[in-house]
Structure formats: C-alpha cells, structure tokens
C-alpha cells in the first residue's frame, strides 16, 4: 500500500508532493542509473534528511528531526530511483527538499516542494442556547484554512460566522449560523483546497408529529443519494433531546453491522437498514417522550442531520382520570 | 573540459600563513567535492583535505589539524587553503582535485597542476 | 588509520610485458581503492576506481582487482607511454596513498 500523498510535476526538476498530517509520504527522484551513486537529501538547503554512499546510509549528521523517520528504495538504487519514503509527516516538514544524485556518469539534483494538509472529520452539531438554535459546523484540526460555505433551501448565505482558533500546526473552526424559528433545510461545506477534499452537512427539520400518549410513532430517516454512498463506512445515531442535551437513543456502525439501541422502546427494522432506511419506531410513548429526536449519518465525508418535534399529548382516557 | 587552476604558492617563514586558492571551470563547482592533495619533492602523495559540494563537511588528514582549513565560495567557483603555522615539513606541491562527486566518495577524478610552497626561513 | 603498502617500490619492465603492481591495507576497505598513473612533473591521474572500474578514456591494457586488504593494478602489455609512478589509494575511511611504485624501462 503506497503512502497516501499524490505528486504535481512541474518544470525545472521540480515536483509537488502533498501529504496528510501525520501519515507517510514518498518523495520522488530519479536519476540515469550509473554505479557509485551518491544520494543526499537536503531540507531548505540547509538540514541534512539523509545520506547514502558507499552502499550504505550514513547518518552521522542527520538533522535529528529526521531521526527514524527516512529510508530509501534500496532495492531500486540500482535501478535509478532516490526517492525517499518519509514517515508521520508534520505541518513543520513543509518545505524545499533536494535531491543529489552522483554517480559515475553524473550529477543531478531535483527539488521536491512537500505541502501538508490536516482535515481531521468535521462535525456538524445541533444546539440550543436558551431560547435560540444553532447549527454548527465545526472542524477540530484543519490545514490550510479552509473554505467554509452555507446554503439555506439550496441558496447560498453571505453570512457565515467563524471562529478560529490557531494552534502551532493547525487551525480549529467553528461557523455557527442561527437557525432559531426556521423549518428551512441547511447545508454546510467545509473544503480543504489542498488536500482536494470537502465534507458536507446537512441539516433537515421534518413537520412536527402529535402523538396520544401509548401511541406509537415511526420517524424517517434516509440518506440523501448525493452524499450517500453505501460502500463508504459511517455511522448512524438516533438521540433525544432533553433540558438542552441530547441522550443517544441507539446507534448503527456500517462497518461492523452492529445495532446498540439503549432504550428498550426503541426498534429499528433490520430489512429496512439493509436498504439503507434507518427509519426507527418508538414504542408505547409517555408525556415526557416530547421533543426533539435528531438522526445523525455521518461518514469521512459528510453528516446528514434530520431532526424530528415529537409533541406527546395526553390521551383523552388519561385526560377524563384527570 | 574540466579544469583547476591553483594560485598563491611561495616561499614563506615558518610559523607563517598563506592561502592558497583554486579556480575551478568547465563543470558545475556547487554540485562537486573538492580536494586538496599534496606532494614532498621527490616523494609520494599526501592527502590533505575535503570539503563538500555544499560546504557541510570538511575533513582534515591529522599532520594538518588545527593548522589548516578548507573553505569554498561556490558563487566564484572557488576553492582555497588557508595554511597557519607552516613549518618546514609543509613544503611540497599541493593540487587541487575534484571528488567524483559530492565528497562522500573521496577519491580525485579531476586535479589541477599544482601550487609550490616553500617553507623556509 | 589505514595505512596502504605498495610493491614493489620500483618495477624494471620492457614494451610488450604484462606488470603486476600490488597494494596491501592495513585494515579491510571493501572494494574503496582507486588507482592514479603520475608522470614526473605531472599532476596524477585516475586510472581505475572502487578497485576494478575502470575511468572513461583510459586504455583497457590496464586492469584492477581485489577486495578488502589485497589488491592489484595490471597492465597487459606495456606501451612506452605507461613508464611512470603509480599510486594505490583506499578511499574507505577518509584517505590514504601507497608510497608508490615507479614503473621504469629495463
């Protein structure tokens, strides 16, 4: 399995690899092979990253930030091919490499620009700050900065919040958008230029369900063709709200199958989920039971929220007792 | 084609100094090691010392440590010998020669016609 | 250090012969030897490295062999232009030169 980092060529010798926050790279050189061959890689013309002559490493002044993170295709040496496979790359590894090559027949250097990108998951949460409600789109650590955008009904929203907060490698943002009192759809895109990836959320209020006390009640909840895609792992959540928080109902993982359901009154139909319907029921429903119940989907690249007003009333039997 | 020139040779007192300097043409200067090596009249070869393509590494031959050091500006494609505290035992002609390539080899592919230095009072 | 013994220090040969010039480390240096022909007045000049390669433009009358403490510079058939000093040098730990063999006419 090769290092997940892909390569932009561009003239003068020069090459762009981009690489993920702590994961392994390659960055390529090659040269006309020939024998004696002589490699030096060099970070910002200055740090020595790795030496080989004489058939073997020499690492006596290897700049220690490279320590047991950098080898060489030995096997390929002979075949023309310097690269250098790095490991756990950092934001602080961004930079100029280069590559010398001597043999016997000739000196080459090639220069390897080495871009790192961070996109750790974002999240899209739902939250109630005393009388108002939020969306929130959120990404713990991302680099570079990414581009955030909203739409409402499809339409794109010129306001769009964000608080930032920069850590040493990376960025944390939250973009909240105040949805208080709106039965709109929203959408949330958070893209990562660099690393070519976007993640989406989606937020869908359904119509309000009134229900008698004992009743039952079955609520939706289907993917959206366009972000869904079944071979991809991801996660599905149903929870309730209560004062403010929600309480996880029962949750489904893809990749294992597995269904975890915590509250006993609780069915999810298994033919149902096979074609990816996670529609649930709720079982013999009390007064408290009102509220609003959230079905989260979420994968590496997207979060599908649709949240559901459960208002529980009374039956007119328990009404008359009254 | 490739050549060496070497400059600044004499005869000089000991305990004195004096630097020798070599002009290198015909290849890229920035993407080779260079050597200085030198001869005893009338006896064998003598490695002196190393320096780098790129000027991290310098290495000296022990009869010369401390005394000597080897230095490069690849902006003027030139190598020098800065000689502190000649003594007679110095007195020999020293070469300038080019490594096969960075210096990691170190054997002399390339030498330029030497430089005579005389120490004596 | 390594300290690299040549012999003979002088070797009587005519045209047409084959020569044989040894050189001996003091310590193991792998195939890290290179051989340089110098003649009287003259800078040296590289005639074969990592003990048997020989360098781009020399003769292929001259040959190298050996691997870690012995080691043999051969000349097939001698040409008057090859009567000269040849000098033995380990390149494995820094450097150091053999005293030499002066290759002279019988």
């Known amino acids: 399995i090769f290092p997940l980092a892909f390569f932009i060529y561009v003239p003068m010798n020069e090459q762009i690899v981009i690489g993920r926050l702590d994961e392994d790279i390659i960055l390529p050189s090659s040269f006309e092979r020939g024998s004696e061959v002589v490699i030096h890689w060099k970070y910002q013309d200055s740090y020595k990253v790795h030496s080989y002559y004489k058939g073997s490493d020499h690492l006596e002044s290897q700049d220690p930030r490279y320590a047991n993170r950098t080898s060489l295709f030995y096997n390929e040496i002979q075949n023309g091919n310097a690269s250098l496979f790095f490991r756990r790359v950092s934001l602080l590894d961004e930079g100029i490499y280069t590559c010398y090559v001597g043999t016997a027949i000739q000196v080459i250097t090639n220069k390897v620009v080495l871009k790192v990108g961070v996109f750790l998951t974002p999240v899209m949460k739902y939250e109630k700050r005393n009388t108002n409600s939020f969306l929130i789109c959120s990404v713990l650590s991302v680099y570079p900065r990414p581009i955030i955008t909203w739409k409402m009904d499809n339409t794109p929203i010129s306001e769009n919040n964000m608080e930032e907060t920069g850590s040493l490698d990376s960025f944390s943002i939250n973009s909240p958008l105040n949805i208080t009192g709106s039965n709109s759809s929203y959408e949330c895109t958070i893209e990562n230029s660099l690393l070519k990836q976007t993640w989406t959320g989606r937020w869908t209020m359904k119509d309000g369900l009134h229900k008698m006390q004992s009743e039952h009640v079955s609520l939706s909840c289907q993917p959206v063709n366009d972000y869904f895609s079944p071979n991809q792992d991801f996660k599905v959540t149903w929870s309730r709200m209560k004062s403010g928080t929600f309480s996880v109902l029962a949750y489904y993982l893809s990749s294992s199958q597995n269904t975890i359901i915590n509250e006993s009154r609780f069915s999810w139909n298994k033919e149902l989920i096979n074609q990816s319907d996670f529609s649930m029921n709720l079982m013999d429903l009390n007064l408290s039971d009102s509220g609003e119940y959230l079905c989260n989907i979420s994968s590496d690249e997207y979060t599908l929220l649709t949240i559901h007003t459960v208002h529980v009333e009374p039956s007119q039997e328990t009404a008359s007792h009254n | 084609q490739v050549q060496l020139v070497e400059s600044g040779g004499g005869v000089v007192q000991p305990g004195r100094s004096l630097r020798l300097s070599c002009a290198a043409s015909?290849?890229?200067?920035?993407?080779?090691?260079m050597h200085w090596v030198r001869q005893a009249p009338g006896k064998g070869l003598e490695w002196v010392a190393i320096?780098?393509?790129?000027?991290?590494?310098?290495y000296y031959a022990d009869s010369v440590k401390g005394r000597f050091t080897i230095s490069r500006d690849n902006s003027k494609n030139t190598l020098y010998l800065q000689m502190n505290s000649l003594r007679a035992e110095d007195t020999a002609v020293y070469y300038c020669?080019?490594?096969?390539?960075?210096?990691?080899?170190?054997?002399?592919?390339?030498w330029g016609q030497g430089t005579l230095v005389t120490v004596s009072s | 250090d390594i300290q690299m013994t040549q012999s003979p220090s002088t070797l009587s040969a005519s045209v047409g012969d084959r020569v044989t010039i040894t050189c001996r480390a003091s310590?193991?240096?792998?195939?890290?030897l290179a051989w340089y022909q110098q003649k009287p007045g003259k800078a040296p000049k590289l005639l074969i490295y990592?003990?048997?390669s020989l360098e781009s433009g020399v003769p292929s009358r001259f040959s190298g062999s050996g691997s870690g403490t012995e080691f043999t510079l051969t000349i097939s058939s001698l040409q008057p232009d090859d009567f000269a000093t040849y000098y033995c040098?380990?390149?494995?730990?820094?450097?150091?030169f053999g005293q030499g063999t002066k290759l002279e006419i019988k």
């Open positions: 320096i780098w393509y790129d000027g991290s590494n310098k």
């Open positions: 040098q380990q390149y494995n730990s820094y450097s150091t």
């Open positions: 990592k003990a048997s």
């Open positions: 015909g290849f890229t200067f920035s993407d080779y090691g």
């Open positions: 310590q193991s240096i792998s195939s890290w």
């Open positions: 020669a080019r490594d096969r390539s960075s210096g990691a080899l170190g054997y002399f592919q390339h």
